[in-house]
């Protein structure tokens, strides 16, 4: 069998809301993946599991099941959304993200994604990690790949 390539393209949109009383930030982050099937037979994308970390703490998880079938030598672009919550021991971030004296409120998040594909009863998992900048002070829609944060110490896996 030939390879199945998974490429994390980047953040497509980040929508922010706040709970003032709980000093909590809610970020709905939609990411984009390109999955390429280099085989001469179809493969099924069985599931995608994703999580987002802030400062080594998992702030959001998502799982998509029975996603799609990718034909021979074909590629599909898949969007998935991870709802994230920055709260409790990280509630100090609420002050930063809602700071009225600045307009740009960048934070760095680690996006982790695992894609499980199956073909002829065989299962394969491909994982990726990427650091991304997100502005936690406003809603943002991105051109694909715009929000990439290149960290030489922890490169893409």
């Amino acid at each position: 069998p030939r390879s199945i390539d998974v490429k994390y393209i980047g953040v497509k949109s980040a929508y922010v809301s706040y709970d003032v009383q709980k000093r909590t930030i809610y970020l709905n982050i939609t990411n984009t993946l390109n999955i390429t099937n280099n085989n001469y037979y179809s493969v099924e994308v069985e599931n995608i599991t994703a999580q987002v970390q802030f400062s080594k703490t998992v702030i959001g998880k998502a799982r998509l099941n029975n996603i799609t079938i990718i034909g021979p030598l074909d590629m599909k672009q898949i969007d998935y959304t991870v709802p994230t919550v920055i709260a409790e021991e990280m509630s100090y971030m609420y002050d930063f993200c809602t700071l009225i004296s600045i307009k740009v409120h960048n934070i760095v998040l680690m996006m982790q994604v695992t894609v499980t594909t199956t073909y002829f009863g065989h299962s394969e998992q491909i994982s990726q990690e990427r650091y991304q900048y997100v502005d936690c002070g406003r809603n943002t829609t991105y051109q694909l790949g715009q929000s990439e944060y290149l960290n030489v110490l922890q490169p893409q896996q």
Partner: antibody
Framework: EVQLQQSGPVLVKPGASVKMSCKAS????????IHWVKQSHGRSLEWIGV????????NYNQKFKGKATLTVDKSSSTAYMELNSLTSEDSAVYYC???????????WGQGTTLTVSS | DIVMTQSPSSLSVSAGEKVTMSCKSS????????????LAWHQQRPGQPPKLLIY???TRESGVPDRFTGSGSGTEFTLTISSVQAEDLAVYYC?????????FGAGTKLELK
């Protein structure tokens, strides 16, 4: 329906002060910042400052510090701007504008016309 | 403060024409973190308050017709109206939304020939 209803036109004498209002409805007042913008006759727009109705935090354009004072009354969902030591240079239309925290301006009030003349 | 410079100051066009107006900022409006440009375009029709058209340099506000397109990056931005309608006659302002104090261009006035 979101509305920012501003107070009516005002004519005042030089040296006086004026307090104009911006009454918000159709949304949770404390969830959005209120900005104030000046538009002099036939001229462009100038940002005066912003206030958070939740905690009264403010941020002013240095040019308007000492000239404008922004306040809110949460109980009536109303934002206020007071302008002091008025001169003819302060004659303009003043708009209140809503933003969801640091997001973009999404709703503008209809404007309050201030005329300073002796 | 970031200075916003718009050109031309006025444009005389016929209905159905394509129109392009320019906006330049004295400093970059690019958020170097997320690579997003924090520039907005507002439309002000005669006797009305301004209305948001475009934010993030290229994202149309909901309800804004798709004949309005924003583009550009860093310090140079463009607003294009693909086919001008009578209701588009207005003054168009670009706005720095990257850093305080927020600043506006002097506007481009769109008039009918």
């Amino acid at each position: 329906e979101v509305q920012l209803q501003q107070s009516g036109p005002v004519l005042v004498k030089p040296g006086a002060s004026v307090k104009m209002s911006c009454k918000a409805s159709g949304y949770t007042f404390t969830d959005y910042y209120i900005h104030w913008v000046k538009q002099s006759h036939g001229r462009s727009l100038e940002w005066i400052g912003v206030i958070s109705p939740y905690n009264d935090n403010t941020n002013y354009n240095q040019k308007f510090k000492g000239k404008a004072t922004l306040t809110v009354d949460k109980s009536s969902s109303t934002a206020y701007m007071e302008l002091n030591s008025l001169t003819s240079e302060d004659s303009a239309v003043y708009y209140c504008v809503r933003t969801y925290y640091s997001n973009y301006f999404d709703y503008w009030g209809q404007g309050t016309t201030l005329t300073v003349s002796s | 403060d970031i200075v916003m410079t718009q050109s031309p100051s006025s444009l005389s066009v016929s209905a159905g024409e394509k129109v392009t107006m320019s906006c330049k900022s004295s400093q970059s409006l690019l958020n170097s973190g997320n690579q997003k440009n924090y520039l907005a375009w507002h439309q002000q029709r005669p006797g009305q308050p301004p209305k948001l058209l475009i934010y993030g340099a290229s994202t149309r506000e909901s309800g804004v017709p798709d004949r309005f397109t924003g583009s550009g990056s860093g310090t140079e931005f463009t607003l294009t109206i693909s086919s001008v309608q009578a209701e588009d006659l207005a003054v168009y302002y670009c706005q720095n939304d990257h850093s305080y104090p927020l600043t506006f261009g002097a506007g481009t006035k769109l008039e009918l020939k």
